[in-house]
């Protein structure tokens, strides 16, 4: 990603509010000017900043990928919040994409956890109760999963 072409869009437009930095920092929703004298507001829906900062450019808003739903839009002080669509999940160790949840557990196992936006269905052995960590079941039973609702921000 090259920011070169984005830089002009993130400079101060006439309608953008300006204020003076406090101890060299600008408040959330702003970035500092090139000469360090002014705080310039981020552009709603385009970029944002979440903390007091001396950033020369506001952070670009995340755009939800296909396969994701937007739970809340990007504001000048908060990034977009994206969530995997129903029936898909995002693991912590592979946050770049939503993966399809399994439709059921392998034979000899029972489902103890539903598909949520951040986890696959959870299966355990009927007898031992130990979790199944395999990616793809050898044989699937017709055990359906119901999607969860809680949200998780995507970066």
């Amino acid at each position: 990603i090259t920011q070169q072409d984005l830089a002009p869009q993130q400079r101060a437009a006439p309608q953008q509010k300006r204020s003076s930095p406090s101890e060299g920092l600008c408040p959330p929703g702003h970035h500092i000017s090139e000469d360090g004298r002014d705080c310039i507001s981020c552009k709603y829906g385009q970029d944002y900043s979440t903390h007091w900062n001396d950033l020369l450019f506001c952070l670009r808003c995340t755009r939800c990928d296909s396969g994701e739903v937007e739970l809340s839009p990007c504001t000048t002080t908060r990034n977009t919040v994206c969530q995997c669509e129903e029936g898909t999940f995002r693991e912590e160790d592979s946050p770049e994409m939503c993966r399809k949840c399994r439709t059921g557990c392998p034979r000899g196992m029972v489902k103890v956890g539903d598909c949520t936006p951040w986890s696959d269905i959870e299966c355990v052995h009927k007898e031992s109760g130990t979790k199944h960590s395999g990616e793809v079941p050898a044989v699937e039973e017709t055990v359906t999963s119901s999607p969860g609702t809680p949200a998780s921000p995507c970066s």
Partner: nanobody, 128 residues
Framework: EVQLLESGGGLVQPGGSLRLSCAAS????????MGWFRQAPGKGREFVSA????????YYADSVKGRFTISRDNSKNTLYLQMNSLRAEDTAVYYC?????????????????????WGQGTLVTVSS
Amino acid sequence: EVQLLESGGGLVQPGGSLRLSCAASGSTFSSLDMGWFRQAPGKGREFVSAISRSGDNIYYADSVKGRFTISRDNSKNTLYLQMNSLRAEDTAVYYCAVDSQPTYSGGVYYPRYGMDVWGQGTLVTVSS
């Protein structure tokens, strides 16, 4: 502790070109996010350009966009600023700087005004 040494400044006529260099030592150059700032006589420090450690993220001030080009050669531990179509208002001491507390978001580098490691500067004078 990283140390920076700028060179390449001098007197040039309006419309002319200069190439500034910044040699870095004392640190792993390829891990440094860096920038160029300038200070005109009697004025404050002004951001000119910045580049991420990989060279993938590049930024320019409006006043130099289309005329200046920042680049780096990690194998030579050197940062460059190619300045074309120079104007009288580009006259300033140019400083190379390191952003030792860089901001990354979504894998993208965002430069700060308060870069905290500086060279001694090189004077660029644009005059006929």
